[in-house]
Interface confidence: low
């Protein structure tokens, strides 16, 4: 008995060949002897089987003595032994239909688990091996699970089902719903406008949900909600926004927030959460704001930064085109009795300048000018 493997939802073609290379009487039956289809002269006739409207043949091949049974939109329950009766001979084909589906949805939030479930006909004992887009192999029986999905798991998963030394391959497209970056940091001088962007790492036709930005200012004892918004079919609408600071939000994706000006009291960390419709859990992106201020008070030139800085960052004060007067791995540096000229305050990481603020120190009889 010939064995053919099929995929749920696909089309399969079971072959049946006569010795005479001409159109002769034939018909296909299932194991219960119920007629599926056959011919009367040059016409195809369909029996009252459950396959009635999913069964077909290739009339163009009949004259060559080929009488295939085509079954469309395969279902697991189509697994059966199919018998072709032609020229007083019987050709038997065992069809085994398998289905591989992802748990509930193929769009999963970062950190969630992916479970692939194999649907198989009774009496079969298949083995399954799946390869993720990043080349990770997982093996299993009826179910395969991958916990803690990462962004790199987005893409096509290729799964091979093995049965009776025959194999059938499934391709499942998995979309991991996440922001492009888990965390980002923005460096700004005091007074500058701040732009926060939250690009998504996926595209879907319709995107609906709601979001909120919670902010923990370095100077504040507790966090507060800066803005809440709704997302409907990729259109953004603000629900509620604090008066101080008064954030502005773009109406289209990617999610975009504007802080009118960087101030020391705003420096800190934020957490943008996005809850998507019909999804349990939320997407998160952390955003950090570092603010720099350079000031001269009487005979003291000071440079300060607020916000989440790494201990390896260097804060320096230097007179333009000269060596740094002071460099420290601290959040404030100062120079007493600074020379007149253009002073630069620099925040750098391994020689790369992240933030720069200039302040002009005038001769002692005049007041400082901040450009």
């Amino acid at each position: 008995k010939k064995v053919v493997l099929g995929k749920k939802g696909d089309t399969v073609e079971l072959t049946c060949t006569a010795s005479q290379k001409k159109s002769i009487q034939f018909h296909w039956k299932n194991s219960n002897q119920i007629k599926i289809l056959g011919n009367q002269g040059s016409f195809l006739t369909k029996g009252p089987s459950k396959l009635n409207d999913r069964a077909d043949s290739r009339r163009s091949l009949w004259d060559q003595g080929n009488f295939p049974l085509i079954i469309k939109n395969l279902k697991i329950e189509d697994s059966d032994t199919y018998i072709c009766e032609v020229e007083d001979q019987k050709e038997e084909v065992q069809l085994l239909v398998f289905g591989l589906t992802a748990n509930s949805d193929t769009h999963l939030l970062q950190g969630q688990s992916l479970t692939l479930t194999l649907e198989s006909p009774p009496g079969s004992s298949p083995s399954v091996q799946c390869r993720s887009p990043r080349g990770k192999n997982i093996q299993g029986g009826k179910t395969l699970s991958v916990s803690q999905l990462e962004l790199q798991d987005s893409g096509t998963w290729t799964c091979t089902v093995l049965q009776n030394q025959k194999k059938v391959e499934f391709k499942i497209d998995i979309v991991v719903l996440a922001f492009q970056k888990a965390s980002s940091i923005v460096y700004k001088k005091e007074g500058e406008q701040v732009e926060f962007s939250f690009p998504l790492a996926f595209t879907v036709e319709k995107l609906t949900g709601s979001g909120e930005l919670w902010w923990q200012a370095e100077r504040a004892s507790s966090s507060k909600s800066w803005i809440t918004f709704d997302l409907k079919n990729k259109e953004v609408s603000v629900k509620r926004v604090t008066q101080d600071p008064k954030l502005q939000m773009g109406k289209k994706l990617p999610l975009h927030l504007t802080l009118p000006q960087a101030l020391p009291q705003y420096a800190g960390s934020g957490n943008l959460t996005l809850a998507l419709e019909a999804k349990t859990g939320k997407l998160h992106q952390e955003v950090n704001l570092v603010v720099m201020r350079a000031t001269q008070l009487q005979k003291n030139l000071t440079c300060e930064v607020w916000g989440p800085t790494s201990p390896k960052l260097m804060l320096s004060l230097k007179l333009e085109n000269k060596e740094a007067k002071v460099s420290k791995r601290e959040k404030a540096v100062w120079v007493l009795n600074p020379e007149a000229g253009m002073w630069q305050c620099l925040l750098s990481d391994s020689g790369q300048v992240l933030l720069e603020s200039n302040i002009k120190v005038l001769p002692t009889w005049s007041t400082p000018v901040q450009p």
């Epitope: 007629k35 056959g38 009367q40 002269g41 195809l44 006739t45 009252p48 409207d53 077909d56 469309k72």
Partner: antibody, heavy 115, light 108 residues
């Protein structure tokens, strides 16, 4: 099966009518097209398998009718070309149920060919 | 397919019998591929009986079909006022499916 509205067309022209399916898996069932001239009986034009797009025609309508299907919108279409007054009729789409007969029908599209 | 009579008038509560004769057998593998429809003006046909004798879901039991090979019959008993319509037989054993010329039933 929801069919498109009536059509008044000139001789020699073409017309394309639609049949939108709902309430079942579109690719599971063949869509058949039939016509009925005023006061006359029913004639089978052809059938289309929405899953594959395969169409089979009554010899009498080969070259006259073209059947297509769009899986994304669950809609079957029939285009009639080189229309004459003989083509004035009500055109139905239909599908089989569990048995052999046409159990589900559209309400029909009236095509009137007139100069 | 030849239907007879072309029209008939039956009294309320009585039996209506419509015949359909095929030019060749519509039987295949033990099944008779004959179907019966009812059509009222301005409406699409409604399937009553499929495979010669099977009552379609939702159709009253006063409708019944019989026959095999080339000779088939549709019976309506007892006839009700709402049964006034045109009735068609149709074979589906081979392509193209064909219909009878119709029988117009009038209720007296």
């Amino acid at each position: 099966l929801q069919q498109s509205g009536p059509e008044l067309v000139k001789p020699g022209a073409s017309v394309k009518m639609s049949c939108k399916a709902s309430g079942y898996t579109f690719t599971d069932y063949v869509i058949n097209w039939l016509n009925q001239r005023t006061g006359q009986g029913l004639e089978w034009i052809g059938e289309i398998y929405p899953g594959s797009g395969s169409a089979y025609y009554n010899e009498m309508f080969k070259g006259k009718a073209t059947l297509t299907a769009d899986k994304s919108s669950n809609t079957a279409y029939m285009q009639l070309s080189s229309l004459t007054s003989e083509d004035s009729a009500v055109y139905f789409c239909a599908r089989r149920g569990t048995g052999t007969g046409f159990a589900y029908w559209g309400r029909g599209t009236l095509v009137t060919v007139s100069a | 397919l030849t239907q007879s009579p072309a029209s008939l008038a039956v009294s309320l509560g009585q039996r209506a019998t419509i015949s359909c004769k095929a030019s060749q057998s519509v039987d295949y593998d033990g099944d008779s591929y004959m179907n019966w429809y009812q059509q009222k003006p301005g409406q699409p046909p409604k399937l009553l009986i499929y495979a010669a004798s099977n009552l379609e879901s939702g159709i009253p039991a006063r409708f019944s079909g019989s026959g095999s090979g080339t000779d088939f019959t549709l019976n309506i008993h007892p006839v009700e006022e709402e049964d006034a319509a045109t009735y068609y037989c149709q074979q589906s054993s081979e392509d193209p499916p064909t219909f009878g010329g119709g029988t117009k039933l009038e209720i007296k």
